[in-house]
Interface confidence: medium
């Protein structure tokens, strides 16, 4: 025997108390699939979060935050204040990054320049707060002809986590 | 299942210092941010510190601020508190908590004692 | 950061309904979340995101929040409701505020 539910389309609910009958979904609420017995509440996006998709009956609500920060996590479960490029984020806010570190975006931690002299390397430009220091070729290669610039290193994109 | 388990505890001098750990299991620890929160005898829930999923980011109660550092070893899935010049109202049960975010659960530890007291 | 003003105490009679409150400036722009407590018990999510309850936590619990106050129902309070009741407010940033608690005596 079918179950009279699995009819029920997504934006719907089965009604018990109203013989099985598919009930659209309560404002505020959805269904993302076919068969549900309830609606899930929509997302809110509230606080520093704003909404990036209106919640319709068959889908939920997205969120994204406020100009000024950014999003963590899956699905942007929490909101993390943004800094200039060149700055990291600490406990007393944004803060400068020190000398010999650099962050070209506007979230994660201030990272140590490349070290070229490790490479056997010349220093072709040096590193700034905002920007890794680019590496040229070795001492030994700045012979005539020798026109190889080895280019800067991606900066690392540092991990991101919700709360 | 998510586990939180305190530990570290115990009486100290007003002054003195103390190093609170919580051993996490259940979850992969560094997705998450992690929270201590504290409870004076009698008292009300208090906030006081948050540290980011990769350590590098850290948030504290001005209570607390400058003399209370939150740390953690995502290899050793340990969350750590080190309390320094601590003061008898400082006396509280400390629980590690992972609080709810959108999408995601909310779970305590069983908590610790801290007592300041001479 | 917001100041959440709770009642000390709050009483009810057995199969009655209790409401406990939490106020604060503009708190229904935030996301409130109340937890229940028993002594010698760490704190129990009982209502998130404003009014959405977890799973395992029964439908007598109820939330609402607008304007300045946010409240906590609970429609036919049992013995066992008997506890500590914190509210908490999260603007989806990072730091958390409590509540100062309120006491629920099931008379």
């Known amino acids: 025997l079918q179950d009279p539910c699995s009819n029920c389309p997504a934006g719907t609910f089965c009604d018990n108390n109203r013989n099985q009958i598919c009930s659209p979904c309560p404002p505020n609420s959805f269904s993302s699939a076919g068969g549900q017995r309830t609606c899930d509440i929509c997302r809110q996006c509230k606080g520093v979060f704003r909404t990036r998709k209106e919640c319709s009956s068959t889908s939920n609500a997205e969120c994204d935050c406020t100009p000024g920060f950014h999003c963590l996590g899956a699905g942007c479960s929490m909101c993390e204040q943004d800094c200039k490029q060149g700055q990291e984020l600490t406990k007393q806010g944004c803060k400068d990054c020190r000398f010999g570190t650099f962050n070209d975006q506007k979230r994660g931690i201030c990272q140590p320049w490349t070290n070229c002299s490790l490479d056997g390397k010349s220093v072709l430009v040096n590193g700034t707060k905002e920007s890794d220091a680019v590496c040229g070729p070795s001492p030994a290669d700045l012979s005539p002809g020798a026109s190889s610039v080895t280019p800067p290193a991606p900066a690392r994109e540092p991990g991101h986590s919700p709360q | 299942q998510v586990q939180l388990v305190e530990s570290g505890g115990g009486l100290v001098q007003p002054g003195g210092s103390l190093r609170l750990s919580c051993a996490a299991s259940?979850?992969?620890?560094?997705?998450?941010?992690m929270h201590w929160v504290r409870q004076a005898p009698g008292k009300g829930l208090e906030w006081v510190s948050v540290?980011?999923?990769?350590?590098?980011?850290?948030y504290y109660a001005d209570s607390v601020k400058g003399r209370f550092t939150i740390s953690r070893d995502n290899s050793k899935n340990t969350l750590y508190l080190q309390m320094n010049s601590l003061r008898a109202e400082d006396t509280a049960v400390y629980y590690c908590?992972?609080?709810?975010?959108?999408?995601?659960?909310?779970?305590w530890g069983q908590g610790t004692l801290v007592t300041v007291s001479s | 950061d917001i100041e959440l003003t709770q009642p000390p105490s709050v009483s009810v009679a057995p199969g009655q309904t209790a409401r406990i409150s939490c106020s604060g400036d503009?708190?229904?722009?935030?996301?409130v979340s109340w937890y229940q407590q028993k002594p010698g018990q760490a704190p129990v999510l009982v209502i998130y995101?404003?009014?959405e309850r977890p799973s395992g936590i029964p439908e007598r619990f109820s939330g609402s929040n607008s304007g300045n106050t946010a409240t906590l129902t609970i429609s036919g309070t049992q013995a066992e409701d008997e506890a500590d009741y914190y509210c908490?407010?999260?603007?989806?940033?990072?730091?958390?505020?409590f509540g100062g608690g309120t006491k629920l005596t099931v008379l």
């Open positions: 995101s404003d009014s």
């Open positions: 908590a992972r609080l709810y975010a959108q999408f995601e659960g909310d779970f």
């Open positions: 503009n708190i229904g722009s935030k996301y």
């Open positions: 540290i980011s999923g990769s350590g590098s980011n850290t």
């Open positions: 908490q407010s999260w603007d989806g940033s990072i730091s958390r505020v």
């Open positions: 259940g979850f992969t620890f560094s997705d998450y941010y």
